[in-house]
């Protein structure tokens, strides 16, 4: 290799030395010099760092607040973060998940295209020609309507998107 | 206090493989590139290559490419060096060597500011 | 490739001497160069990195100088545990070469 033009990759310059940095789950106790070596600490209970750094503290590992329908989905470790996710029901409000809320329910006309998730909401659409949905419900697809052909009925009442048709029997008088 | 402990000595037939280890303590392995020289009997340096211990991505002098493999077990802080189809002009003591970096009027100088003790390498039918 | 000549291969001086190694490189490797220090059945040893550098834990009576093409190691008062031979290696152009070494004997 020609010269170096930077210290390594995992290294950082300081007082003319390209020191080691340390590696996740550490933090820097003291830089090297030309007579010692970087000299780096495990993080504590309760704290992690996630990358090759120089950091002399390490952060706190995330708090799922209980308050705000949050649990611990993965407990964190030295080099990785606590993940939170929401209670059931619940979904979180942003992609850190700091905070809950209710999934979303879909009025009558329309059906769930995708049940909620800890961290999407409940996606509704619209019941189509042939389907209908009767109640408000984060779970509840849009049904399609009954065929009365089927049951040797007929219909007497068209379905709606938000009503089932209804069928009567066939009218005997009829030729 | 930074140490490189390498493997005993081997004695091989041409033709053959020869696998030297070199154990690293004291300081980061993953970060200092580690380099491997050899020096035949009665004879001078020679540069074989290196490895970056932390991508496992090594670099060959051209003189030993194909025949040379640089490896490392960043668990056990090790890196390794596999010379194949020996011949008796392999014969020769091989070292693992750290890089330092110097950093010095707009510049960075290395140099290898570690080494370890040697591998003995006999090549004879 | 570089190629370094040190001269002179063999040198015979006393405890207390002073003594000069040069290095001549075949092209310029500006202050791209080392020195080391090996003694038989041992490893190699640094003494001088950047072309007049002093490693750590180095004596003092040991220096470099130099740069381009030509670079020097001096011994300023040559001490009993200075009979060894020195290398000096550029680091300046792959791939990085050893110069063919000085022995530094007892007169």
């Known amino acids: 290799p020609e010269p170096p033009t930077a210290c390594r990759e995992k290294q950082y310059l300081i007082n003319s030395q390209c020191c080691s940095l340390c590696q996740p789950g550490q933090k820097l106790v003291s830089d090297c010099t030309e007579f010692t070596e970087t000299e780096c600490l495990p993080c504590g209970e309760s704290e992690f760092l996630d990358t090759w750094n120089r950091e002399t503290h390490c952060h706190q590992h995330k708090y799922c607040d209980p308050n705000l329908g949050l649990r611990v989905q993965q407990k964190g470790t030295s080099e990785t973060d606590t993940i939170c996710t929401c209670e059931e029901g619940w979904h979180c409000t942003s992609e850190a998940c700091e905070s809950c809320v209710l999934h979303r329910s879909c009025s009558p006309g329309f059906g769930v295209k995708q049940i909620a998730t800890g961290v999407s909401d409940t996606i509704c659409e619209p019941c189509p020609v042939g389907f209908f949905s009767n109640v408000s419900s984060a779970f509840e697809k849009c049904h399609p309507w009954t065929s009365c052909e089927t049951k040797d009925l007929v219909v007497q009442q068209a379905g709606t998107n938000k009503t089932d048709v209804v069928c009567g029997p066939q009218d005997r008088l009829r030729a | 206090q930074v140490q490189l402990v390498q493997s005993g000595a081997e004695v091989k037939k041409p033709g053959a493989s020869v696998k030297v280890s070199c154990k690293a303590s004291g300081y980061t392995f993953a970060g200092y590139y580690m380099y491997w020289v050899r020096q035949a009997p009665g004879q001078g340096l020679e540069w074989m290559g290196w490895?970056?211990?932390?991508?496992?991505?090594?670099t060959y002098a051209q003189k030993f490419q194909g025949r040379v493999t640089m490896t490392r077990d960043t668990s056990i802080s090790t890196a390794y060096m596999e010379l194949s189809r020996l011949r008796s002009d392999d014969t020769a003591v091989y070292y693992c060597?750290?890089?330092?970096?110097?950093?010095?009027?707009?510049?960075?100088?290395?140099?290898?500011?570690?080494w370890g003790q040697g591998t003995l390498v006999t090549v004879s039918s | 490739d570089i190629q370094l000549t040190q001269s002179p291969s063999f040198l015979s001086a006393s405890v207390g001497d002073r003594v000069t190694i040069t290095c001549r490189a075949s092209q310029g490797i500006s202050s791209y160069l080392a020195w080391y220090q090996q003694k038989p059945g041992k490893a190699p040893k640094l003494l001088i990195y950047a072309a007049s550098t002093l490693q750590s834990g180095v004596p003092s009576r040991f220096s470099g100088s130099g740069s381009g093409t030509e670079f020097t190691l001096t011994i300023s008062s040559l001490q009993p545990e200075d009979f060894a031979t020195y290398y000096c290696q550029q680091l300046g152009s792959y791939p990085w070469t050893f110069g063919q070494g000085t022995k530094v004997e007892i007169k």
């Open positions: 060597a750290r890089e330092k970096i110097y950093y010095g009027s707009g510049n960075y100088y290395p140099s290898f500011d570690y």
């Open positions: 490895i970056n211990p932390d991508s496992g991505a090594p």
